[in-house]
Interface confidence: medium
């Protein structure tokens, strides 16, 4: 069962500056929308270690965004 519900941004807290690349299973980018006016970078960690929000202003987040955009466009 979901423990907490809300309809705003997907991340709370400013986000971590970096995550070890070896620990990353996947990265998801949420672009600004009606629900949230900022870009969010969500990292899913390997071995069921949960998820982390990357600070979108961090160097690693900027690199991930670039990489994903290159792949998609």
């Amino acid at each position: 069962f979901p423990m907490f519900k809300r309809g705003r941004c997907l991340c709370i807290g400013p986000g971590v500056k970096a995550v070890k690349v070896a620990d990353i299973e996947k990265a998801s980018i949420m672009y600004p929308s009606n629900n949230c006016d900022k870009i969010e970078v969500i990292i899913t960690l390997k071995e069921n270690k949960g998820q982390r929000c990357l600070n979108p202003k961090s160097k690693q987040a900027r690199l991930i965004i670039k990489k994903v955009e290159r792949k998609n466009f």
């Epitope: 979901p2 907490f4 709370i12 807290g13 969010e40 270690k49 949960g50 998820q51 982390r52 929000c53």
Partner: nanobody, 129 residues
Framework: EVQLVESGGGLVQAGGSLRLPCAAS????????IGWFRQAPGKEREGVSL????????YYADSVKGRFTISSDNAKNTVYLQMNGLKPEDTAVYYC??????????????????????WGQGTQVTVSS
């Protein structure tokens, strides 16, 4: 050095109240989300409540909604868990923990202890019937 120190636990009768403070030091309070977890003997650690000091957002597990209230005093770098209407099933060791970020999917958060960077030592809460 980052430290989280819980206090305020004890023995209380069913229906009673306790207030658990979690004093934080060694990091910028506003940059973190503070969560309360609990662990009863033989059970997994479960999320109870959390608060984001930066915007005051609060969240509660269904089992404690309407009975527990989380609040923070940023000047004192302390988060409080006010527990009213305590039940025997609330008996557990209560831990506070800190993380710099928690993501949601589909507007829901599933508490995962792995997502928290720092933990306190815990405080025992026993509710007798």
């Amino acid at each position: 050095e980052v430290q989280l120190v819980e206090s305020g636990g004890g023995l209380v009768q069913a229906g009673g109240s306790l207030r658990l403070p979690c004093a934080a030091s060694g990091f910028t309070f506003d940059d973190y989300v503070i969560g309360w977890f609990r662990q009863a003997p033989g059970k997994e650690r479960e999320g109870v409540s959390l608060i984001s000091s930066s915007d005051g957002s609060t969240y509660y597990a269904d089992s404690v909604k309407g009975r527990f209230t989380i609040s923070s005093d940023n000047a004192k770098n302390t988060v409080y868990l006010q527990m009213n209407g305590l039940k025997p099933e609330d008996t557990a060791v209560y831990y506070c923990a800190a993380t710099s970020s928690i993501p949601y999917y589909s507007g829901s958060y599933y508490p995962n202890p792995f997502e928290y960077d720092y933990w306190g030592q815990g405080t025992q809460v026993t509710v007798s019937s």
